[in-house]
Amino acid sequence: AIELVPEHQTVPVSIGVPATLRCSMKGEAIGNYYINWYRKTQGNTMTFIYREKDIYGPGFKDNFQGDIDIAKNLAVLKILAPSERDEGSYYCACDT
């Protein structure tokens, strides 16, 4: 079975300091899938952030950067200049 595992359950972030979220794929090669990222905020609203290669949800392109590391089987999401409004639970997902 394929599993996407977050590198850290909690990521402390300083305002304005770039932060990186990572998800590791277990059981399969990440290269075979399209990687997606979502954010869940208070009220359980799930918001689309990014889909490979260059598709971003409204308002996310300027401050977020999606990436993959095929050699390490990682999905990566960079928050370039975090602010309080970026707080929430981030989810990586994959599809074909």
Partner: antibody
Amino acid sequence: QVTLKESGPTLVKPTQTLTLTCTFSGFSLTTSGVGVGWIRQPPGKALEWLALILWNDHTIYSPSLKSRLTITKDTSKNQVVLTMTNMDPVDTAAYFCARDKWELRDAFDIWGQGTMVTVSS
Amino acid sequence: EIVMTQSPSFLSASVGDRVTFTCRASQGISRYLAWYQQKPGRAPNLLIYVASTLQSGVPSRFSGSGSGTEFTLTISSLLPEDFATYYCQQLISYPYTFSQGTRLEIK
């Protein structure tokens, strides 16, 4: 073993239509994430990306040549055909077909040997 | 379309040298970049994809790095068979444009 081979005329007259065929083996164009692209290279010059057809029949063309190009596939024959209308001497080039793979994020991992096409009256 | 600029256009080096090619994109392409080697009269050969992932069968003396708009391909110790032309290609936005290439010559 994956192979691709281009075939078509070596000499085309100006204003004529060029038809090139890429015959491949060792993979299927019905497999998710696979495509076949065409690239050309004028003598002594750089590579130019022309067109791509994907496993799901999606086609993409270079904007500068879009009005002149058509790419199609015949999965039963393992062939991809590129047609280019209104040929001009500046279209003289080696034409390559190559396999595109999503797992390599669309890099061309296997190329044909290329076929040289000269446009002259 | 995205313009890929490679420097230098020509590079002279000797067997055993360490050489670096630079490729710049006219806009950010994350790490969606490939490097190819082409020898005269031959088709290009894929060396690296996603900026730094070595293609299967490519010797480890080849390495790639970079993100955004600036990328490098390094050959750690040149062998005679490495003298060829090298191209980068962006893979984020159609058309997937190539650079003009760098010809690596024997000094």
